[in-house]
């Protein structure tokens, strides 16, 4: 079975980790693939290792574990996320987490960042 | 319409390395959503499950072959095949190669080569 | 290893019977057993996945039912190209194991 948190939130401008859980008592996994709607975003194979979609590279690391953590946040990154389990002899698992992009709690309380600098 | 084909020698002498061939026509093996099984059927007897291979070179097989069977994936010539080393007389079989699918939960051997009989003898 | 037990191991009937098949796993394998029917010199062909799902293009007179170790496949009117060997398969865990196969015959 798949195991993942459904719904979570995160800032505009922050990152996010997507994860999700896989138990079986008698599947092997092989693979695992990761996708923003139908886009891949990143695939996991035990034999060749990490693939990370060339336009997510800037933004997506892969791990922790067979999870990925999604950087650099932005409002269109709010979505459905999937991922996928090829797993012998059991099959195709499949998991799904809702991603909600919210505005940064600055931008939200209307505040201006300011970066200062040592002096002297 | 998926289609398998096994090519190999039909006559292996003891103590040699049987190698066998499945060529894949109306599909890619390179699918993610499939797996690939050698399977073999003694003359007059049932079916034992040799081994099965993603595309990515895991591989699955039966310990009573304990380390005798190798199964490599050639993705450029849509091909996996068989190697089993040290064979006797006990291996002289009906080779058959399969694709595990549909997409189900722990899916059965949905489309079939047609079987090659490989003998063992000197 | 899971041992797959078929009954009867061979059996004969007539055109127009209801034949009935049993499996038993040494364990619970869930609903992950299929059926296979091979005729002579012919490689086996899906008939049932997941105990009871009929594959795409077989005559719904095949049928099968049960879950966890017990398992049954079933004719219910019997024809003439059904005359063949069947098999039972688990696919829960790995060594993939088979029955020992029924062969319907002609009586």
């Known amino acids: 079975t798949i195991d993942t948190k459904r719904n979570i939130s995160a800032e505009e401008g922050g990152s996010v980790i997507l994860q999700c859980h896989f138990s079986s008592d008698t599947a092997e996994v092989t693979q695992v693939d990761w996708k923003q709607q139908d886009q891949l975003l990143a695939i996991y194979s035990v034999d060749l290792g990490w693939h990370v979609a060339s336009v997510f590279s800037d933004r997506v690391v892969p791990g922790p574990s067979l999870g990925l953590t999604f950087q650099s946040l932005t409002m269109n990154d709010t979505g459905e996320y999937f991922c996928t389990y090829h797993t012998y002899p059991g099959g195709i698992y499949k998991g799904r987490i809702f991603l909600k992009v919210q505005e940064s709690s600055d931008d939200r309380n209307g505040l201006a960042q300011f970066q200062t600098a040592p002096l002297g | 319409q998926l289609q398998l084909q096994e090519s190999g020698p039909g006559l292996v002498k003891p103590a040699e390395t049987l190698s066998l061939t499945c060529t894949v026509s109306g599909g890619s093996i390179s699918s993610y959503d499939h797996y690939w099984t050698w399977i073999r059927q003694p003359p007059g007897k049932g079916l034992e499950w040799i081994g099965t291979v993603y595309y990515s070179g895991s591989t699955f097989h039966n310990p009573s072959l304990k380390s005798r069977v190798t199964i490599p994936v050639d993705t450029s010539k849509n091909q996996f095949s068989l190697k089993l080393s040290s064979v006797t007389a006990a291996d002289t079989a009906v080779y058959y190669c399969?694709?595990?699918?549909?997409?189900?939960?722990?899916?059965?051997?949905?489309?079939w080569g047609q079987g090659t009989l490989v003998t063992v003898s000197s | 290893d899971i041992q797959m037990t078929q009954s009867p191991s061979s059996l004969s009937a007539s055109v127009g019977d209801r034949v009935t098949i049993t499996c038993r796993a040494s364990?619970?394998?869930?609903?992950?057993l299929n059926w296979y029917q091979q005729k002579p010199g012919k490689a086996p062909k899906l008939l049932i996945y997941?105990?009871?799902s009929l594959q795409s293009g077989v005559p719904s007179r095949f049928s099968g039912s049960g879950s966890g170790t017990d398992f049954t496949l079933t004719i219910s009117s019997l024809q003439p190209e059904d005359f063949a060997t069947y098999y039972c398969?688990?696919?829960?865990?790995?060594?993939?194991?088979f029955g020992g196969g029924t062969k319907v015959e002609i009586k």
């Open positions: 399969a694709r595990v699918g549909p997409d189900v939960s722990h899916p059965p051997f949905d489309y």
């Open positions: 398969q688990q696919s829960y865990s790995t060594p993939i194991t």
């Open positions: 364990q619970s394998i869930s609903s992950y």
């Open positions: 997941a105990a009871s």
